[in-house]
């Protein structure tokens, strides 16, 4: 449309503006979770809060079961951050006692999920080997890219070990979406 | 408003429709910082260029004392990257000493003050333990999301330490924030 | 604009408003480099897939030979992520062999070509040291941000190291821009 | 499966003390914050307090009425928690439950044990 | 600290009956950390309801629960003769953690 100016004429136009402030949007924070257990090579999703603190949701981009859930299709900027913290990572213990020295990783995945297609397409990785020397090691993971989503798609973050989530602060770890 | 076209008619409609380059804009840069004294656990906030080379404020987003000002109330999109670098660090001082070898950590806040509201709201927060074996290390932390804010809200930057902050290029360290 | 309405009225009025469907558009994902021969500080250029999966181009943003053109002047939001591997960091080897302890890092550079200027400049750098104790190591560096950019710049990544860039999948090294 | 067993409630006379234990198995105990719960004769269920784990320091918390008497500790080597009570009360007649925390999420309650105090 | 309201103290209901218990909370809980008890006499408490509005393993789909910011609600949309017995909710999202009172549920 370049160089089309939206004029107002007596002819019925129909031109696709809406205004910006209508636009799905969300911004989601961590809320508090421990697995009980986790099944190997399989990332659990992480719930998150979507109504209190600097949390939100609107314009019928609705949050649910640990999806956020697309109301209209479009590009849509999507990004998380999850920080991770833990004790000695195993790679520092296994250092030590002088084996050899794979190291630990974590990992934050953003997963599309479309009900008509049979698996979930990962849109976007961060992952990190862990050597740490330190006791205690923390650190973010940030992700975030442009895609072109479908109405009904559903938005959820995997990570490698929720056990390994910093929990304790909304501007640590978040997850939010909106309509370009 | 999905569905709803923006057609040209005779009577006034008053629809929220507005100009994309007309909405508050900026991109700050690095600049050398003045270590200033600040209080135990007071993160000192960084200071930015705001209109040589890359940087720039625009549409009534202005840049003062340390302060990004919001001019008018909407959902932002607001980022930042700090790039830290230092020598060896105490904690890796400590291992050789066989002490406890307790991290030391680099640590970015996005904070946002509004004047009728007594504390300072922690917007995005990164934060990584540094326990570097080399002698020479640097790495950066980036951080960013999306917040409504309100007219006259201010937005700066925190650092656990202003004098491990990488000042000696525009694009290692920067500042932004616009209008969605 | 603020507090100016965009009501229709008989008199021809030109308001540069838009379709934020039409604006231009891209994301690219990563494929395997062929390392090319390039000269000592010069960081060589990835290459990206531009249509097939994860990747797109839209509304006359284009990619040819490594470069995203840029179709209309305007602010751009600009990003990438590179995920690096590699076995362990020559610092490690030489820190074993008792020698003083210099780094390595993997640095990531979103660069502008304007063919009026003589000089890319450097838009964006991400720069890490990597001082890895594990033999095998992984990490992403993440960049993104808002820049004023002119009809027919040019946009491209480049890397400190192409063979240690993870091609492996699409969601673990991207680049892309939209105009705000 | 998830378990948890109480055990060491009894009869106590006012003034003494007494140290409930709760053996854990089924999950990963040292990533799960743990409470203690408990329930007066024909009342309504009172929290008594929490530990988190290791990672979030360890630290502990309590409603007022045990603040100062009662301490919470947890061994995750043993998959154990504890829960030492000193200079006890009638009012602390209760049956007392231990349940994970492990915020969102389902939740385990051990059957309670009961203790007694009275002159 | 949080007090949390239950109404009514007591329901009368007839199996076959929908039941819709009410929680207010004094100040806003997440409804991550809203959760839902059945007791009956010399039993531990079974948790039903998670996360406002999450059934726990095994509850089953007569049992559910909404609400959200201060006021929650807990509906069994047909009553078994198994339901009747003391339903509480709870928040754990600030200390100290708090308990509603109870609502008992009687046969009518």
């Known amino acids: 449309l370049k160089g089309q100016e939206f004029a107002p004429s007596h002819q019925q136009v129909y031109a696709p503006l809406r205004a910006d402030g209508d636009k799905p949007r969300a911004h989601l924070t961590v809320v508090r979770q421990t697995p009980t257990q986790h099944f190997k090579n399989q990332f659990p999703a992480l719930h998150w809060e979507h109504e209190l603190g600097l949390a939100f949701t609107k314009n019928r981009m609705n949050y649910t079961n640990k999806f956020l859930l697309i109301p209209e299709s479009g590009d849509y900027f999507i990004y998380s951050q999850v920080t991770f913290r833990g004790m000695t990572s195993e790679c520092s213990e296994i250092r030590q006692a002088g084996r050899p020295n794979k190291p630990d990783s974590i990992t934050v995945v953003i997963t599309k999920v479309t009900d008509s297609y049979p698996e979930p397409t990962q849109l976007l990785m961060g992952t990190k080997s862990v050597c740490e020397v330190g006791s205690n090691w923390f650190q973010p993971i940030y992700l975030g890219a442009m895609f072109s989503l479908q109405e009904g798609d559903k938005l959820m973050v995997n990570v490698s070990d929720i056990s390994l989530v910093d929990y304790t602060k909304e501007d640590k770890t978040f997850f939010g979406a909106f309509l370009l | 408003l999905k569905g709803q076209e923006f057609a040209p008619s005779h009577q006034q409609v008053y629809a929220p429709l507005r100009a994309d380059g007309d909405k508050p804009r900026a991109h700050l840069t690095v600049v050398r910082q003045t270590p200033t004294q600040h209080f135990k656990n007071q993160f000192p906030a960084l200071h930015w260029e705001h209109e040589l080379g890359l940087a720039f404020t625009k549409n009534r987003m202005n840049y003062t004392n340390k302060f990004l000002l919001i001019p008018e109330s909407g959902d932002y999109f607001i980022y930042s990257q700090v790039t830290f670098r230092g020598m060896t660090s105490e904690c890796s001082e400590i291992r050789q000493a066989g002490r406890p070898n307790k991290p030391d950590s680099i640590t970015v806040v996005i904070t946002k003050v509004t004047d009728s509201y007594p504390e300072p709201t922690q917007l995005l927060m990164g934060t990584k333990s540094v326990c570097e074996v080399g002698s020479n290390w640097f790495q950066p932390i980036y951080l960013g999301a999306m917040f409504s804010l309100q007219e006259g809200d201010k937005l700066m930057v925190n650092v656990s330490d202003i004098s491990l902050v990488d000042y000696t290029k525009e694009d290692k360290t920067f500042f932004g924030a616009f209008l969605l | 604009l603020k507090g100016q309405e965009f009501a229709p009225s008989h008199q021809q009025v030109y308001a540069p408003l838009r379709a934020d469907g039409d604006k231009p558009r891209a994301h690219l994902t990563v494929v395997r480099q062929t390392p090319t021969q390039h000269f000592k500080n010069q960081f060589p250029a990835l290459h990206w897939e531009h249509e097939l999966g994860l990747a797109f181009t839209k509304n006359r943003m284009n990619y040819t030979n490594k470069f995203l053109l840029i179709p209309e002047s305007g602010d751009y939001f600009i990003y990438s992520q590179v995920t690096f591997r590699g076995m362990t960091s020559e610092c490690s080897e030489i820190r074993q062999a008792g020698r003083p302890n210099k780094p390595d890092s993997i640095t990531v550079v979103i660069t502008k070509v304007t063919d009026s200027y003589p000089e890319p400049t450097q838009l964006l750098m991400g720069t890490k040291s990597v001082c890895e104790v594990g033999s095998n190591w992984f990490q992403p560096i993440y960049l993104g941000a808002m820049f004023s950019l002119q009809e027919g710049d040019k946009l491209m990544v480049n890397v400190s190291d192409i063979s240690l860039v993870d091609y492996t999948k699409e969601d673990k090294t991207f680049f892309g821009a939209f105009l705000l | 499966e998830v378990q948890l067993v109480e055990s060491g409630g009894g009869l106590v006379k006012p003034g003494g003390s007494l140290r409930l234990s709760c053996a854990a198995s089924g999950f990963i105990f040292s990533n799960v914050w743990m409470n203690w719960v408990r329930q007066a004769p024909g009342k309504g269920l009172e929290w008594v307090g929490r530990?988190?784990?290791?990672?979030?320091?360890?630290?502990?918390d309590y409603v007022a009425p045990v603040k100062g008497r009662f301490t919470i500790s947890r061994d995750d080597s043993k998959n154990t928690l504890s829960l030492q009570m000193n200079s006890l009360k009638t009012e602390d007649t209760a049956v007392y439950y231990c349940?994970?925390?492990?915020?969102?999420?389902?939740?385990?309650w051990g059957q309670g044990t009961l203790v007694t105090v009275s002159s | 600290e949080i007090v949390l309201t239950q109404s009514p103290g007591t329901l009368s209901l007839s199996p076959g009956e929908r039941a819709t218990l009410s929680c207010r909370a004094s100040q806003s809980v997440s409804s991550s950390y809203l959760v839902w008890y059945q007791q009956k006499p010399g039993q531990a408490p079974r948790l039903l309801i998670y996360?406002?509005?999450s059934r726990a393993t095994g509850i089953p789909d007569r049992f559910s629960g909404s609400g959200s910011g201060t006021d929650f609600t807990f509906t069994i949309s047909r009553l078994e003769p198994e339901d009747f017995a003391v339903y509480y909710c709870q928040q754990y999202g600030g200390s100290p953690y708090t308990f509603g009172q109870g609502t008992k549920l009687e046969i009518k």
């Open positions: 530990i988190k784990s290791k990672i979030d320091a360890g630290t502990t």
């Open positions: 349940i994970t925390d492990r915020g969102w999420g389902e939740n385990y």
């Open positions: 996360g406002a509005s």
